[in-house]
Interface confidence: low
């Protein structure tokens, strides 16, 4: 039998027996001659034990390039593959020769009393006890004991090859303690050497390797890898490593069995590779196997070598962040970088500190972000070894979706006397400012509930069709100013008018603003009355512990049954798109209250008088009358602010100045308070008197003095009084100049 | 499978501007850089820039800072790119790519390697600018 | 600079090999493992051949492979086949934060 590939110019060796297979009897002598090309060896059964002293292999007297192999008085145990093989090749020629030893029809391993067989329960695993026979056809059963049974070959999964030895399904035996092959020969029997029967796991759980990913190192470095594999009991474990640098001077590898606790289903082994100071060329895939010989595992990690420490920003990391107000905003520093950096974040230059509403990590997260949260953030990336810094801005903008001022001002808004022009306004505050603020109406009629109808409080109107302001058919002429845009309590605001040139008819007006988060609108009740009238006397708006009255005016010829209400608090806010509810047709939020009635000639009036006013009398009071003839209800809405009570205080400082003789000094003193305070001057602690040289405007708040002269110099008070107390500021005038003699004098 | 579907041929006036869009689907589009490059007729490629279909964070080449526009609609898995004050040398076909690098915190220590390359591309959309 | 640079056109037999250079600054192949580069049919939308300088997505034979010297990233083509006859582009990520496109290389078999 040949084997390996010829190459082109070389034959194989040629046996002297050309047979594949040859039989002969013990103590007979084996010679076989092999010639070929080159040089050539023999390889022959157990060469690698004592045994060989018997084998005789000799050149052969007649030709270069030959070799005879002689085995004198031959035994069973000589029955194997004899192989006739060039030097450093693969070129073989080969025969299997027989030793027929009926005496000893089992080849015996040498120096082994018995053999051991590793079985797994896996059903479909095979196992083979290697009883090789010095005879081809003989009849072999196995024996397994105990308890003692015997196997016979089925043509199927049990068979006995004499080249092999008995196969069997290894779950069949894996009770027994051993077996051994029996052969029949002339009803004798003859039994091979014992084999112990060792049962193995073979399951391997899983393969881990610490650290998993992401291994990162600087040239010089020591790389340390653990590779664990779990498997189940009666498990060997064979560990492989395969990686980028395997000639690797300073690579240490060391395999141990791990403790487990007892009574563990479960066998751990661990396997280190160490390399002391990798090198680049040491970058790349390390893969672990462990093998138990019937299964493999694998498991693999990248290490990635630096040639030194660096640090340096990702290509995901972004330089604008845009965000809705109340959303979680979250910024990573995305960098590349050994060893990881140490990251910083700092705001318009003051570096962030982490707290329940921010996180400054490797990401930045702002919990819900507002308005104040708009602005430059820089993060500082820098290497914990080299202490190389990068920086990055990233601007983060936060948007705000449309904020309608008025909304706030959830109440009815006051009725309308027929005929009257007004404006209604919708002040709006957004970022982006909005990119367009659209007035649209319904006329009341429409929309309005009956009363007999309950209350919806999340749609309390059922209509739904409103109409653009351009098509005011059947409803108020209606104009549109163009948007102006204000500073209102240090933010920009987009504020829009909308003219009702003539209010006849009680309709609905909505706002509506959008921009690029979102929408805000405003509904606004416009109802007009012919009806009563409410007017305040003495003030528009009274400051708290002062009186005020309500005058409610109606025709008597056309109504009766005046009654002032308040409204009380509204059962819920109002939410976006929902409707204020016509007072009139809900009457169940309004309190009833006392007044007084007075009539002249053609009117009756109904006065609602407040003593003291405190902070909680403000709201919305309704006067109502019925119609004489229709018995209709009439509503008239009137909101009434009372202020709060201030104590003065004054606003800006006056400041020390020096002027020269015969030029003006001009100062401020701006105060506030409520109700307002007087302001008076003092010179040198004494009250301050208005001359030709001495000018008092606008209440006192601005003092000139013109050609000032020498004696004008001095401390000067300004002081705002109101019945809440006082506050003053001070500043010292110094007039520098030699007094110029005046012919008058 | 993955795919990304550009809208159809645009013809456009020169001063006006263009929309393309780019639908995705078969994975997380919220999960992948989406870039957009042009390529004029017989002309190379051109990077234009990319967003961050998970937070609207763009990055535009400075050639065209300033008239590209980068958005996304995460409820429809859709990016967009509009190119405003449009100039004949703008007639090309302008592709959406998507990157090959996931949405990840890089920051994370023991992160694996990261890999970029656009591994998607759309079928491209011709951009016709003439007066 | 605008582009990285590739050569206008490179030429192979069947059974060759040819190599297409692609040359970019210390700002960018120099710096970042990020070269990429695409192969473009006529009329058709680019294909990714190679990332990360040298990695291969699955799909792309074995022929193709990358590597990078210095400022200069170069594409690879073996066993040249009259199916690579196409238009090659690398591109790279640059220290701006940014991507750049090479000029572009047509591909002949002859």
């Known amino acids: 039998a040949s084997v390996g590939l010829p190459s082109v110019s070389l034959d194989l060796p040629r046996l002297s027996i050309q047979k594949d297979i040859l039989t002969i009897k013990a103590n007979t002598t084996l010679q076989i001659t092999c010639r070929g090309q080159r040089d050539l060896d023999w390889l022959w059964p157990n060469n690698q034990s004592g045994s060989e002293q018997r084998v005789e292999v000799t050149e052969c007297s007649d030709g270069l390039f030959c070799k005879t192999l002689t085995i004198p008085k031959v035994i069973g145990n000589d029955t194997g593959a004899y192989k006739c093989f060039y030097r450093e090749t693969d070129l073989a020629s080969v025969i299997y020769v027989y030793v027929q030893d009926y005496r000893s029809p089992f080849i015996a391993s040498v120096s082994d009393q018995h053999g051991v067989v590793y079985i797994t329960e896996n059903k479909n695993k095979t196992v083979v006890i290697p009883c090789l026979g010095s005879i081809s056809n003989l009849n072999v059963s196995l024996c397994a004991r105990y308890p003692e049974k015997r196997f016979v070959p089925d043509g199927n999964r049990i068979s006995w090859d004499s080249k092999k030895g008995f196969t069997i399904p290894s779950y069949m035996i894996s009770y027994a303690g051993m077996v051994f092959c029996e052969a029949k020969i002339n009803d004798e029997s003859y039994q091979s050497i014992m084999y112990i029967v060792v049962v193995v796991g073979y399951r391997i759980y899983d393969v881990v390797l610490s650290p998993s990913h992401g291994i990162e190192l600087s040239v010089g470095e020591k790389l340390v890898l653990n590779c664990t594999a779990r498997t189940e009991l009666n498990v060997g474990i064979d560990f492989n490593w395969e990686y980028p640098s395997s000639k690797h001077q300073h690579k240490k590898l060391v395999n141990r069995d791990l403790k487990t606790q007892s009574g563990s289903e479960m066998k751990k082994f661990l396997s280190t590779l160490t390399i002391d100071g990798v090198t680049r060329s040491d970058q790349g895939l390390y893969t672990c196997a462990a093998s138990s010989g019937l299964m493999t595992k694998k498991n693999s990690t990248f290490v990635r070598v630096h040639e030194k420490p660096f640090v340096a920003f990702g290509s995901g990391m972004e330089s604008l962040v845009e965000a809705t107000v109340g959303e979680r905003v979250r910024i990573p520093a995305k960098y590349l970088g050994y060893p990881p950096p140490e990251i910083k974040w700092y705001k318009n230059g003051i570096p962030l500190e982490s707290n329940h509403t921010i996180k400054a990590g490797h990401v930045l997260t702002i919990m819900e972000v507002s308005e104040r949260d708009t602005g430059n953030y820089t993060v500082i990336l820098t290497n914990p070894i080299s202490k190389e810094k990068q920086s990055h801005v990233v601007s983060l903008v936060v948007y705000v979706p449309p904020q309608i001022g008025e909304k706030s001002l959830i109440s009815p808004v006051d009725s309308y006397q027929y005929g009257t022009t007004q404006t209604l306004t919708c002040t709006v505050y957004a970022i982006p400012p909005p990119h367009h603020i659209h007035w649209y109406w319904q006329l009341e009629e429409e929309c309005a509930n009956e009363p007999s109808q309950a209350v919806s409080v999340t749609n309390p109107y059922p209509c739904e069709e409103w109409r653009s302001v351009e098509d005011f058919q059947g409803g108020n002429k209606i104009e549109v100013n163009k948007n102006q845009f204000a500073l209102i309590e240090g933010k920009n605001k987009t504020v829009s008018t909308l003219v009702i040139q003539a209010a006849n008819v009680s309709a609905l007006y909505k706002c509506e603003a959008v921009n690029k988060v979102g929408r805000g609108e405003r509904v606004i009740s416009f109802h007009v009355t012919r009806g009563p009238e409410i007017t305040l006397q003495p003030d528009m708006q009274p400051t708290e512990q002062e009186s005020v009255s309500l005058w409610c005016t109606a025709d008597r010829s056309t109504f009766e049954n005046l009654t002032w209400y308040k409204l009380g608090p509204q059962p819920l806010p109002i939410h976006v798109g929902e409707l204020p509810t016509p007072v009139c047709k809900n009457l169940d939020t309004l309190w009833k209250l006392n007044a007084t009635m007075f009539s002249n000639s053609t009117n009756d009036i109904l006065i609602m008088e407040l003593k003291n006013a405190s902070l909680q009398d403000q709201g919305d009071y309704v006067c109502l009358a019925q119609d004489r003839k229709t018995k209709k209800r009439h509503c008239v809405v009137r909101q009434l602010t009372v202020l709060e009570r201030v104590a003065p205080t004054i606003t800006g400082n006056l400041e020390n100045q020096t002027t020269s003789i015969g030029e003006s000094i001009e100062v401020s003193c701006t105060a506030s308070g409520n109700p307002p305070p007087q302001i008076m001057w003092f010179k040198d602690n004494e009250t301050l008197v208005e001359d030709s040289g001495i000018v008092l405007k606008d209440g006192n708040r601005n003092l000139t003095i013109r050609r000032v002269r020498k004696e004008d110099e001095g401390l000067y008070t300004c002081q705002a009084c109101s019945v809440l107390g006082c506050a003053k500021v001070e500043a010292f005038f110094i007039i520098e100049g030699a007094q110029e003699k005046t012919n008058l004098e | 499978e993955v795919q990304l579907v550009q809208s159809g041929a645009e013809v456009k006036k020169p001063g006006a501007s263009v929309k393309v869009s780019c639908k995705a689907s078969?994975?997380?589009?919220?999960?992948?850089?989406m870039h957009w490059v042009r390529q004029a007729p017989g002309q190379g490629l051109e990077w234009m820039g990319w967003?961050?279909?998970?937070?609207?964070?763009?990055n535009y080449a400075q050639k065209f800072q300033g008239r590209v526009t980068m958005t996304r609609d995460t409820s429809i898995s859709t990016a967009y790119m509009e190119l405003s004050r449009l100039r004949s040398d703008d007639t090309a076909v302008y592709y959406c790519?998507?990157?090959?690098?996931?949405?990840?915190?890089?920051?994370?220590?023991?992160?694996?390697?990261?890999?970029?390359?656009?591994?998607?591309w759309g079928q491209g959309t011709t951009v016709t600018v003439s007066s | 600079q605008a582009v990285l640079t590739q050569p206008r056109s490179v030429s192979g037999s069947p059974g060759q090999s040819v190599t297409i250079s692609c040359t970019g600054t210390?700002?960018?192949?120099?710096?970042?493992?990020?070269v990429s580069w695409y192969q473009q049919l006529p009329g058709k939308a680019p294909k990714l051949m190679i990332h990360?300088?040298?990695k291969r997505p699955s799909g792309v034979p074995d022929r193709l492979s990358g590597s990078k010297s210095g400022n200069t990233a170069s594409l690879t083509i073996s066993g040249l086949q009259s199916e690579d006859e196409a238009d090659y582009y690398c591109?790279?990520?640059?220290?701006?934060?940014?991507?750049?496109f090479g000029g572009g290389t047509k591909l002949t078999v002859l």
């Open positions: 990360d300088v040298s």
């Open positions: 210390r700002s960018d192949v120099g710096t970042y493992n990020y």
């Open positions: 790519a998507r990157d090959l690098q996931g949405i990840t915190i890089f920051g994370v220590a023991n992160s694996p390697p990261y890999y970029y390359g656009m591994d998607v």
């Open positions: 078969g994975y997380t589009f919220t999960g992948y850089y």
């Open positions: 967003i961050n279909p998970n937070s609207g964070g763009t």
């Open positions: 591109i790279s990520y640059t220290l701006h934060r940014t991507w750049m």
